[in-house]
Amino acid sequence: TTELTEEKYEYKEGQTLEVKCDYALEKYANSRKAWQKMEGKMPKILAKTERPSENSHPVQVGRITLEDYPDHGLLQVRMTNLQVEDSGLYQCVIYQHPKESHVLFNPICLVVTKGSSGTPGSSENSTQNVYRTPSTTAKALGPRYTSPRTVTQAPPESTVVVSTPGSEINLTNVTDIIRVPVFN
């Protein structure tokens, strides 16, 4: 098993989550990448890139946009217009097979709550958006857990549609650490 550091991101409804997932470009540049959500012990593929990956060829599934940059070993994920029901544990993965994915990045525990998204919170726990307005607030906590790096039995995948990316970017701050078991 490999210890992965989970970060908890807190957002208000309507905000946008952005994640940058690094990968070893020499190993995975031509692999498909995916964004998945854990539903119980089972991962659900929400969106995946085309194969072979093309630089910045955006793939959009609903409110989720993936942009793969194989020259830089980076997958950029955006989830726009966040809703309370989006809360959960997410992962960037190398999509090797419908039944097996290699986790790339520290899993993200997303918590979306109702409330106004147009005004940043207290300056202590918010970061101004450096590119786009309105500025938004995100808070990251850092639970740790031990998890296998291979996820099995992925459910059916979503349909992939090519479109353009979302536009808002949110940043994070860090506060606390706890331990959370994720897989048995």
Partner: antibody, heavy 117, light 107 residues
């Protein structure tokens, strides 16, 4: 050969303007985010601006917003930095670098910009 | 803006020995951290990205570790060509920021 070559750096008076250029070769320029990073004499590195592959997104460090403009010509595989209202604190070696979505993996040799009266 | 702080400012190590450089972020940058090497009169060179992934062509003696706010660059057995200035850079926040650098000098 992978290469980025900057040009345009000179001595300019405060308040003056300058246009830096960067010629790329050996990379798929149109597929790359591109950036300008500067380094004041004896100091550390500072990211200045970056631009997406198609030029649709351009971002700047706060200290140059409204004064500097980054642009590109994919057909000519060239990157530009238009610098207006120059200040003494803009004095630095300006590097053209491939990247801007994350890291900067290919760098030019740099061009020196000196702002002084 | 995320502030990146490197320590020590200068590190004196003998060739063949191990060097450990530190970088601290003022808030979490997850694994979105890179390390660069710069020699006098030269442009920086990317060594590590994603906190621990070696860039193309970088020798195995260079390794990176850490996540969130604490990061380390380790050079296992220093070669003469490794004496240079090292910078960390975060790209979690789109206002990219570098550390002030650590000068690695021959002891």
């Amino acid at each position: 050969e992978v290469q980025l070559v900057e040009s345009g750096g000179v001595l300019v008076q405060p308040g003056g303007s300058l246009r830096l250029s960067c010629a790329a070769s050996g990379i798929t320029f149109s597929n790359s985010w591109m950036s300008w990073v500067r380094q004041a004499p004896g100091k550390g590195l500072e990211w200045v601006a970056n631009i997406k592959q198609d030029g649709s997104e351009k971002y700047y460090v706060d200290s140059v917003k409204g004064r500097f403009t980054i642009s590109r010509d994919n057909a000519k595989e060239s990157l530009f930095l238009q610098m207006n209202s120059l200040r003494a604190e803009d004095t630095a070696v300006y590097y053209c670098a491939r990247g801007g979505i994350s890291t900067f993996d290919i760098w030019g040799q740099g061009t020196m910009v000196t702002v002084s009266s | 803006e995320i502030l990146m702080t490197q320590s020590p400012a200068t590190l004196s190590v003998s060739p063949g020995e191990r060097a450990t450089l530190s970088c601290r972020a003022s808030q979490s940058v997850s694994s979105n951290l890179a390390w660069y090497q710069q020699k006098p009169g030269q442009a920086p060179r990317l060594l590590i990205y994603g906190a621990s992934i070696r860039a193309t062509g970088i020798p195995a003696r260079f390794s990176g570790s850490g996540s969130r706010t604490e990061f380390t660059l380790t050079i296992s057995s220093l070669q003469s060509e490794d004496f240079a200035v090292y910078y960390c850079q975060q790209y979690k926040n789109w206002m990219y920021t570098f550390g002030q650098g650590t000068k690695l000098e021959i002891k």
